[in-house]
């Protein structure tokens, strides 16, 4: 057994439409068939769960219908997209990976991706 390492980018800038994407990669110590990925947001020492999805290796990960996250998986890599972000959502987004099955269970936690969100300036009225 060895500890599971999770890697994610340090910084991501959300698009003007409030969409941020980043890759969460984990070094799997075992042959997991069921994986759970959770995105946590840490801001001012408060932690909240943004979204979570469990998937079978080889299959797509599916978030709940009302989730602000979407994602795709490829091997030990998960491509995560968070939508609907506003400036107030700026914070550290941490990728948590759990190898649920078969035993043993493994937990890996990334160092977090600082997502910066800048609300677009409203378009000024134009005089012609």
């Amino acid at each position: 057994c060895k500890a599971m390492h999770v890697a994610q980018p340090a910084v991501v800038l959300a698009s003007s439409r409030g969409i941020a994407s980043f890759v969460c990669e984990y070094a799997s110590p075992g042959k997991a068939t069921e994986v759970r990925v959770t995105v946590l947001r840490q801001a001012d020492s408060q932690v909240t769960e943004v979204c979570a999805a469990t998937y079978m290796m080889g299959n797509e990960l599916t978030f709940l219908d009302d989730s602000i996250c979407t994602g795709t998986s490829s091997g030990n890599q998960v491509n995560l997209t968070i939508q609907g972000l506003r400036a107030m959502d700026t914070g550290l987004y941490i990728c948590k990976v759990e190898l649920m099955y078969p035993p043993p269970y493994y937990l890996g936690i990334g160092n977090g991706t600082q997502i910066y969100v800048i609300d677009p300036e409203p378009c000024p009225d134009s005089d012609f």
């Epitope: 060895k2 932690v47 948590k96 269970y105 890996g108 936690i109």
Partner: antibody
């Protein structure tokens, strides 16, 4: 605020069964793994079992595998530990604990005492 | 399974003194998955430190954690009367999750 309250402990004979419960409140129960940890009189902490999120995955300590079963009812915010074929060495205070977002056991119940004696 | 060893078994100190508790793992543990708990007689354990060095909510800053790999340390900078208790380290990165045997900090 987060609260965990265990119940169901008592004195039983070797070979018998007992069912412990843990009532949870103050948080989104289904978003957390839930653990059972025990402590024999005057001894240290021993992890017993965990049940994850929707209840489909469970893991057990070797010392209780095949004898203990944990379950959860997310609609009632309740956790259970069914203990069968009890032995004298199962005598302990049993705690339920919440698996925090980062995996550590961030909240604990007050514990319930199980005594297995003839 | 990962075996955790704590030392010393008992630490006898006076209030105001510094306490240094050690936890050693039989194999490498992710620093994200190492916690310290405090337990007083007749009470449930209380989370102090998670992720090797992050203080849990409401824990005073005299408690600090450090370390990586197989060696971890809990430091109490100045012991207060309420700090005399048993301290356990725990790894929660791989099942079965394991606790150390504990270090008792008592009054000299």
């Amino acid at each position: 605020q987060v609260q965990l309250v265990e119940s169901g402990g008592g004195v039983v004979q070797p070979g018998s069964s007992l069912r412990l419960s843990c009532a949870a409140s103050g948080f989104t129960f289904s978003s957390h793994g839930m653990h059972w940890v025990r402590q024999a009189p005057g001894k240290g902490l021993e992890w017993v079992a965990v049940i994850w999120y929707d209840g489909s995955n469970k893991h057990y300590a070797d010392s209780v595998k095949g004898r203990f079963t944990t379950s959860r009812d997310n609609s009632k915010n309740t956790l259970h530990l069914q203990m069968n074929s009890l032995r004298a060495e199962d005598t302990a205070v049993y705690f339920c604990a919440r698996g925090g977002y980062f995996g550590c056991f961030d909240y604990w119940g007050q514990g319930t005492l199980v005594t297995v004696s003839s | 399974e990962i075996v955790l060893t704590q030392s010393p078994g008992t630490l006898s100190l006076s209030p105001g003194e510094r306490a240094t508790l050690s936890c050693r793992a039989s194999q490498s543990v992710s620093s994200s998955c190492l916690a310290w708990y405090q337990q007083k007689p007749g009470q449930a354990p209380r989370l102090l430190i998670y992720g090797a060095s992050s203080r849990a909510t409401g824990i005073p800053d005299r408690f600090s954690g450090s370390g990586s790999g197989t060696d971890f340390t809990l430091t109490i900078s100045r012991l207060e009367p309420e700090d005399f208790a048993v301290y356990y380290c725990q790894q929660y990165g791989i099942s079965p999750f394991t606790f150390g045997p504990g270090t008792k900090v008592d009054i000299k």
